[in-house]
Interface confidence: medium
C-alpha cells in the first residue's frame, strides 16, 4: 500500500499532447506506473509510462496523434488515471476528470529571429507551435531581455496582451550582447498556465557611430 499525499497535474498543449506529472510522498520504488487517458466521446484511449524526474515525482507525455492534429475539443472530458503495477494488478493511484481546454499549457514559441537591429533597438519575431486554431487571436505573450551582469529572474517582464508575434525592444545599449525569451498563454481556461520560455535568442546591438571629432 502507498500512503502519503498524492498530486496529479496535467496540461493539454491544445493539439495532440497531454503532459502529466504525478508526485507521491512516501512513493513507490522500482514500480512500473503509467498514465491512462480515456476520453468520454472518442474511440481511442492512450497510455504513457511515468518516468522519474525526482525522488518522488514522475512525468510522461500522452501523445494523442500527429503534432498538429486537433485531437480534443472544448466539450471533451478525459478521465486520467495513474496506474501502478502490483504483481499482476494495475492499482489506481490517482484519478481526475480532465477538461483539456480548462488546463492549457502551450508549447514554447519557436523560430525566434532578429528582424532588424540598430544601436538602441532591436525588432524580434517568433512563431507559436502546435497551437489550436480554436484560439483565433485570443493569446497573450510575455517577453524578457537578459542584460549583461543580470539574471533572467531580474529581467523585467514585457506583456503583449494580444496575438502579436513580434516586439521592438527599445532603449538598448549600443554594441552590447543581449538574450531574449518569450512565452505564450491562451486567454481560455480556469487552470491554464504560461508555456515554457522559448529557447533564448542571442543578439548584439550595433556599435554607436563614431563622432566626427574622434
Amino acid at each position: 500500500a502507498v500512503n502519503g499525499t498524492s498530486q496529479f497535474t496535467c496540461f493539454y498543449n491544445s493539439r495532440a499532447n497531454i503532459s502529466c506529472v504525478w508526485s507521491q510522498d512516501g512513493a513507490l520504488q522500482d514500480t512500473s506506473c503509467q498514465v491512462h487517458a480515456w476520453p468520454d466521446r472518442r474511440r481511442w484511449n492512450q497510455t504513457c509510462e511515468l518516468l522519474p524526474v525526482s525522488q518522488a515525482s514522475w512525468a510522461c507525455n500522452l501523445i494523442l496523434g500527429a503534432p498538429d492534429s486537433q485531437k480534443l475539443t472544448t466539450v471533451d472530458i478525459v478521465t486520467l488515471r495513474v496506474l501502478c503495477r502490483e504483481g499482476v494488478r494495475w492499482r489506481v493511484m490517482a484519478i481526475q476528470d480532465f477538461k483539456p481546454f480548462e488546463n492549457l499549457r502551450l508549447m514554447a514559441p519557436i523560430s525566434l529571429q532578429v528582424v532588424h537591429v540598430e544601436t538602441h533597438r532591436c525588432n524580434i519575431s517568433w512563431e507559436i507551435s502546435q497551437a489550436s486554431h480554436y484560439f483565433e487571436r485570443h493569446l497573450e505573450f510575455e517577453a524578457r531581455t537578459l542584460s549583461p551582469g543580470h539574471t533572467w529572474e531580474e529581467a523585467p517582464l514585457l506583456t503583449l496582451k494580444q496575438k502579436q508575434e513580434w516586439i521592438c525592444l527599445e532603449t538598448l545599449t549600443p554594441d552590447t550582447q543581449y538574450e531574449f525569451q518569450v512565452r505564450v498563454k491562451p486567454l481560455q481556461g480556469e487552470f491554464t498556465t504560461w508555456s515554457p520560455w522559448s529557447q533564448p535568442l542571442a543578439f548584439r546591438t550595433k556599435p554607436a557611430a563614431l563622432g566626427k571629432d574622434t
Epitope: 498524492s6 478521465t79 488515471r81 494488478r89 494495475w90 492499482r91 489506481v92 493511484m93 490517482a94 484519478i95
Partner: nanobody, 123 residues
C-alpha cells in the same frame, strides 16, 4: 485501505424496492472501483453490479439488468444499489466491495469488503 459499511437492507414484498448504501472511509474513495456482491443461503457469493472510479461505466449480472441500478457519489464517499421489482430469488446478504485494480471488475478478488446487509424478499 478503505473501510466499508453497508445499510438499507430489510424485508420487502416481491415487486417492492430497496436502496442499499455503502459508506466508505479511510482512503481516497475516488480511486476505487466499487461493486455489490450477494450471497444467498447455501450458495456461493456472486457478482451483482459494479461502477468504475469515475462513475462512467457500470456493469450488471444478467439476472438484475433493468431492475437494479448502481451509482456513486464521490463527494459523499458513498455507492448505492437501487433495487426495483424485487424477486424472492434476490434474497441474500448483500456485500459492498472496493478495488483499486483498474482491470478487475467482476472478480471475487476485490481488495476490501463490508460486513454485509440482509435483504429478504417475501412472496
Amino acid at each position: 485501505e478503505v473501510q466499508l459499511v453497508e445499510s438499507g437492507g430489510g424485508l420487502v414484498q416481491a415487486g417492492g424496492s430497496l436502496r442499499l448504501s455503502c459508506a466508505a472511509s479511510g482512503d481516497v474513495f475516488v480511486r476505487y472501483t466499487m461493486a455489490w456482491f450477494r450471497q444467498a443461503p447455501g450458495k456461493e457469493r456472486e457478482f451483482v453490479a459494479s461502477v468504475t472510479d469515475s462513475g462512467r461505466t457500470t456493469d450488471y449480472v444478467d439476472s438484475v439488468k433493468g431492475r437494479f441500478t448502481v451509482s456513486r457519489d464521490n463527494a459523499k464517499n458513498t455507492v448505492y444499489l437501487q433495487m426495483n421489482n424485487l424477486k424472492p430469488e434476490d434474497t441474500a446478504v448483500y456485500y459492498c466491495a472496493a478495488n483499486t485494480d483498474y482491470f478487475q471488475i467482476r472478480s471475487l478478488e476485490f481488495n476490501t469488503w463490508g460486513q454485509g446487509t440482509q435483504v429478504t424478499v417475501s412472496s
